[in-house]
């Protein structure tokens, strides 16, 4: 029951956090946490990389033409997020929710 509740909250909150708070002034801790999550779990977006299309930051000029954050890249270099290609984006690897679910299941046993 606890796992199910945690799982539901993760699903509801992660995409909301990514779309509304990522790279917004005053939310540097959130940005850093999302970057770390994507890099360490080899994932991109909440469900998949296309989730980033809804991000206020990605949609603005501040993103500099990126379609995903640079932290979605397998090899991170500045502006690597401009090309949403599976060769350097955690695209086929799935979203971060799936990766987090697996991690939580393994550590709650």
């Amino acid at each position: 029951a606890y796992y199910q509740q945690l799982n539901t909250e993760l699903k509801e909150n992660l995409k909301d956090t990514m779309t509304k708070r990522y790279h917004q002034p005053g939310h540097e801790a959130v940005t850093s946490a999302v970057d770390q999550l994507q890099q360490e779990f080899h994932c991109c977006g909440s469900n998949n990389s296309q989730d980033w299309r809804d991000s206020e930051w990605i949609r603005s000029q501040e993103a500099g033409g990126r379609v995903v954050p640079d932290s979605c890249c397998k090899t991170v270099v500045a502006l690597c997020g401009q090309r949403d290609h599976a060769s350097n984006i955690y695209k086929v690897e799935g979203g971060c929710i799936t990766k987090l679910e697996t991690f939580i299941q393994e550590h709650l046993r």
């Epitope: 509304k20 708070r21 917004q24 002034p25 005053g26 939310h27 540097e28 970057d35 206020e56 930051w57 949609r59 603005s60 000029q61 501040e62 500099g64 033409g65 640079d70 932290s71 991170v76 270099v77 500045a78």
Partner: antibody, heavy 118, light 111 residues
Framework: EVKLVESGGGLVQPGGSLKLSCAAS????????MSWVRQTPEKRLEWVAY????????YYPDTVKGRFTISRDNARNTLYLQMNSLKSEDTAMYYC???????????WGQGTLVTVSA | DIVLSQSPASLALSLGQRATISCRAS??????????MHWYQQKPGQPPKLLIY???NVESGVPARFSGSGSGTDFSLNIHPVEEDDLAIYFC?????????FGGGTKLEIK
């Protein structure tokens, strides 16, 4: 050509209110983050308000938090700054500004002067 | 808040000389390989003008005489050769962490 035109400045007494406007043209306003930056008579620059492209996120430094409110009307291509409980230290030239890409402010208006004095 | 310390506060140079303005941040302004430090020029009666963004990228329309360098906490703006038109105040600004802050400015005068 990108154009930002501020208006609404003037002389106001301490404790008073003022609403600044910034009319934008020459770019897709609704996809641009916007900021207000002020410059004191001593030429010091201070970033005083930020609003995300869709208006969902705002940010204020502690010096103005609770007194200033930034808003935008994407249909009218206009940015606003509502300033309440004004203090003498709020006396400055107020500029609206936005980055071209990234976070360096490439586009600035000519500014509107706000003087808070009894 | 990240404090930006600019030096010198003022600089008087002859035409053709090199101007070097320094900006030191109280914390790193690096983000995923990008230095979120920018440089502006402000002439009397005008708003600031972006010269350099992200430490070393020259903004469109800015003469090649202007260059920026640095990373982490230490940055510099170079102008070479200095021309009459460069008489202005120069500011650095960081956008790594809110509130975004500006340096105190460096006034460049021509001898």
């Amino acid at each position: 050509e990108v154009k930002l035109v501020e208006s609404g400045g003037g002389l106001v007494q301490p404790g008073g209110s003022l609403k600044l406007s910034c009319a934008a043209s020459g770019f897709t306003f609704s996809t641009y983050t916007m900021s207000w930056v002020r410059q004191t008579p001593e030429k010091r620059l201070e970033w005083v308000a930020y609003i995300s492209s869709g208006g969902g996120t705002t940010y204020y430094p502690d010096t103005v938090k609770g007194r200033f409110t930034i808003s935008r009307d994407n249909a009218r291509n206009t940015l606003y700054l509502q300033m309440n409980s004004l203090k003498s230290e709020d006396t400055a030239m107020y500029y609206c500004a936005t980055p071209r890409i990234g976070t360096g402010f490439a586009y600035w208006g000519q500014g509107t002067l706000v003087t808070v004095s009894a | 808040d990240i404090v930006l310390s600019q030096s010198p506060a003022s600089l008087a140079l002859s035409l053709g000389q090199r101007a070097t303005i320094s900006c030191r941040a109280s914390a790193s302004v690096e983000y995923y390989g990008t230095s979120l430090m920018h440089w502006y020029q402000q002439k009397p009666g005008q708003p600031p003008k972006l010269l350099i963004y992200e430490a070393s990228n020259v903004e469109s329309g800015v003469p090649a005489r202007f260059s920026g360098s640095g990373s982490g906490t230490d940055f510099s703006l170079n102008i070479h050769p200095v021309e009459e038109d460069d008489l202005a105040i120069y500011f650095c600004q960081q956008s790594r962490k809110a509130p975004y802050t500006f340096g105190g400015g460096t006034k460049l005068e021509i001898k």
